[in-house]
Amino acid sequence: MMTGTIETTGNISAEKGGSIILQCHLSSTTAQVTQVNWEQQDQLLAICNADLGWHISPSFKDRVAPGPGLGLTLQSLTVNDTGEYFCIYHTYPDGTYTGRIFLEVLESSVAEHGARFQIP
């Protein structure tokens, strides 16, 4: 039975040209995290595999940095980066958990972090 929950940074905003850390955290389960996929809509950004290391998609190599931890750092943000991001946790033996983050990239210098929220 899958008992875990994913906590994410929720709705976040950042300035154009800046950077942002996408972070998820899996709690309430003893399952082992074996791989985390980071996706934007249907596009793969990066994968962190506990045994194999990191893979960064070639199309994002210049703007994506692994970490911190299982998170992902997006750099040189553009307005086109606005949208939904998903952290997909592959665990053993539970299975797959998915978290959602919405990023808004702002032209102005007013960019505040939204509240954290949980996805069961």
Epitope: Q32, T34, Q35, N37, L44, I47, N49, A50, D51, L52, G53, W54, H55, S57, I88, H90, Y92, P93, G95, T96
Partner: antibody, heavy 125, light 107 residues
């Protein structure tokens, strides 16, 4: 290019423990970030994943076999091994060792990239 | 666990014809799907990974498509060496699971 070679007894008695070894050549098992896996294929049937061990030492087993399976790595011999206890005739199969994730860092996929030739194990008294 | 179902179990095709093999997952695997070819007495060989990318050295007549739960392996023009059994497999969720296989035989 890494190469794999299975070895072990071709005949095992019921209730005993099946022990197989996979010898890795063409590279060091200790400096490679892969999953080392065992897969089997009963005569005339399909493929069944038995289990894998990661470079961190983490093991992952097929739930249907978990209570009977142990996979380990011996870096000094550049080998990894499979032990399957309390065997019965239904464990008769060709056993393959394989490498999973050899191209993960470049291409981001996890699949069984490299296979050994397989070794036939018969369980019979 | 994710159950992989392949169809048909056997496909009879004439050399030079097109072969279309199907694989269905019991739940979404995104594009985390591989295809293998196995000839009698040999170990399986990786053909396709990531649902659609050919492995090194695999001829262009082999192509994969699909995502989520429905996947297809197409062999555009069957050569004599292509008559074999083909398996699909999902990854990364544990446990790794294979489909039951499709045997492509000469018509």
């Amino acid at each position: 290019q890494l190469q794999l070679q299975e070895s072990g007894p071709g005949l095992v008695k019921p209730s005993e423990t099946l022990s197989l070894t996979c010898t890795v050549s063409g590279g060091s098992i200790s400096s490679s970030r892969y999953y080392w896996a065992w897969i089997r294929q009963p005569p005339g049937k399909g493929l069944e994943w038995i289990g894998s061990i990661g470079t961190s030492g983490s093991t992952y087993y097929n739930p249907s076999l978990k209570s009977r399976v142990t996979i380990s790595v011996d870096t000094s011999k550049n080998q990894f091994s499979l032990k399957l206890s309390s065997v019965t005739a239904t464990d008769t199969a060709v056993y393959y060792c394989a490498i999973e994730g050899a191209n993960f860092r470049d291409f981001g996929y996890v699949a069984f990239d490299i296979w050994g030739q397989g070794t036939m194990v018969t369980v019979s008294s | 666990e994710i159950v992989m179902t392949q169809s048909p179990a056997t496909l009879s095709v004439s050399p030079g014809e097109r072969a279309t093999l199907s694989c269905r997952a019991s739940q979404s695997v995104s594009s985390n799907l591989a295809w293998y070819q196995q000839k009698p007495g040999q170990a399986p060989r990786l053909l396709i990974y990531g649902a659609s990318t050919r492995a090194t050295g695999i001829p262009a007549r082999f192509s994969g498509s699909g995502s989520g739960t429905e996947f297809t392996l197409t062999i555009s023009s069957l050569q004599s060496e292509d008559f074999a059994v083909y398996y699909c497999q999902q990854s990364p969720p544990w446990p790794r699971t294979f489909g039951g296989g499709t045997k492509v035989e000469i018509k």
